[in-house]
Interface confidence: low
């Protein structure tokens, strides 16, 4: 399904990288990591260098919004999280810099990074109700919620 | 070269149990995936259980789920499949495959074993 | 889980013949799809990864395509040395499937 209508004509401008390489662990303790070329997963990890990092990238939305929009990149490369539709993986995707404008289609970069406590939640911009998500016996995903787990630990300092 | 031989087959009773091994050789078998992959009789391929690289993920078909135990020793380069409650469907030949470095479970699998038959005396 | 079909269950053909098979997966499945070769008393060879990627050391004869739910493998000259059991798996889902296979005979 395509974005949301309403939020084509919002236009995000990249401000900063706010986080360097940081690990995700799910509500069960596992780890997201490269499942292969295109996908992540989630896996628990004796040993965390297995485990992604990522770095996060601020955007500042030309309409007044008070949520932290943000890009999800891996650290050291050029991979981008991207949403696809619900219960579809995400999509690590290959751009030669950070996008300096997001507008449109191109949403699908972006996620709303929401905190509660130590639980973080990162929110499709394109899919407003879908969470970025690890599902038992499948890929990062996007999913609205339960089974899919929605909320994740923030590791960093990690190296 | 990859070498992946299992053991363990034989004659059992339904309702009993079984333990198969895999040993590996010819690579780093502590960063690979592995898989156990039946087939009875004149019948096609079913998958049975995967491990991931370092033995903390496992993965069970619903045939089989509660009944068999997937574990790995990396020490030893050997894969185990330890099989209670035996069924009469469980008679297969039961072969050991490899799938891609480290931690992919969904993987096509470029090296197998021979196999090794279970059967049920009556 | 995600279910695998394949067709037809045998195919009759010639040494020279086009071989076509095809294999429909219950649920869309990107390009997760590999396709095996299993001769009687052997165990399965792996022909194809990721839909149309040939394995290493196998002949171009042998080509796959599709995505999605709807694929196919293709033997474009069948040889002696093909008639087999053909069988598809979906690497897709952690739960691997298999498709029932094809078994290509001398008609």
């Known amino acids: 399904s395509a974005p949301f209508s309403f939020l084509s004509n919002v236009k995000y401008n990249f401000m900063r990288i706010i986080k360097y390489e940081f690990i995700l662990n799910d509500a069960l303790n596992q780890s997201i990591i490269r499942a292969n070329d295109q996908y992540l997963t989630a896996a628990a990890l004796h040993n965390l260098d297995e485990a992604v990092k990522f770095d996060m990238g601020a955007y500042k939305s030309s309409k007044d919004d008070a949520k932290i929009t943000v890009i999800l990149r891996i650290s050291k490369t050029q991979l981008y999280v991207t949403a696809q539709d619900e219960d579809q993986p995400v999509l690590l995707k290959e751009m030669p810099e950070i996008p300096k404008t997001i507008t449109g289609s191109e949403t699908n970069l972006l996620f709303f990074w929401e905190t509660h406590g130590t639980k973080n939640y990162f929110t499709s911009v394109a899919h407003p109700n879908l969470f970025i998500a690890t599902k038992q016996d499948y890929w990062v995903c996007l999913a609205g919620g339960p089974p899919s787990i929605t909320d994740f630990q923030i590791l960093e300092n990690q190296a | 070269q990859v070498q992946l031989v299992e053991s363990g087959g034989g004659v059992v009773q339904p309702g009993r149990s079984l333990r198969l091994s895999c040993t590996a050789s010819g690579f780093t078998f502590s960063m690979f995936g592995v898989h156990w992959v039946r087939q009875a009789p004149g019948k096609g391929l079913e998958w049975v259980a995967a491990v991931s690289y370092d033995g903390s993920n496992k993965y069970y078909a619903e045939s089989v789920k509660g009944r068999f135990t997937i574990s790995r020793d990396n020490s030893k380069n050997i894969l185990f499949l330890q099989m209670d409650s035996l069924r009469l469907e469980d008679t297969a030949v039961y072969y050991c495959?490899?799938?891609?470095?480290?931690?992919?479970?969904?993987?096509?699998?470029?090296?197998w074993g021979q196999g090794t038959l279970v059967t049920f005396s009556s | 889980d995600i279910q695998m079909t394949q067709s037809p269950s045998s195919v009759s053909a010639s040494v020279g013949d086009r071989v076509t098979i095809t294999c429909r997966a219950s649920q869309g499945i990107s390009s997760w799809l590999a396709w095996y070769q299993q001769k009687p008393g052997k165990a399965p060879k792996l022909l194809i990864y990721?839909?149309?990627n040939l394995e290493t050391g196998v002949p171009s004869r042998f080509s796959g395509s599709g995505s999605g739910s709807d694929f196919t493998l293709t033997i474009s000259s069948l040889q002696p040395e093909d008639f087999a059991t053909y069988y598809c798996q979906q690497t897709s889902s952690f739960l691997l499937s298999f498709g029932g296979g094809t078994k290509v005979e001398h008609k």
């Open positions: 990721e839909a149309s």
């Open positions: 495959a490899r799938g891609r470095p480290k931690v992919v479970i969904p993987a096509p699998l470029a090296h």
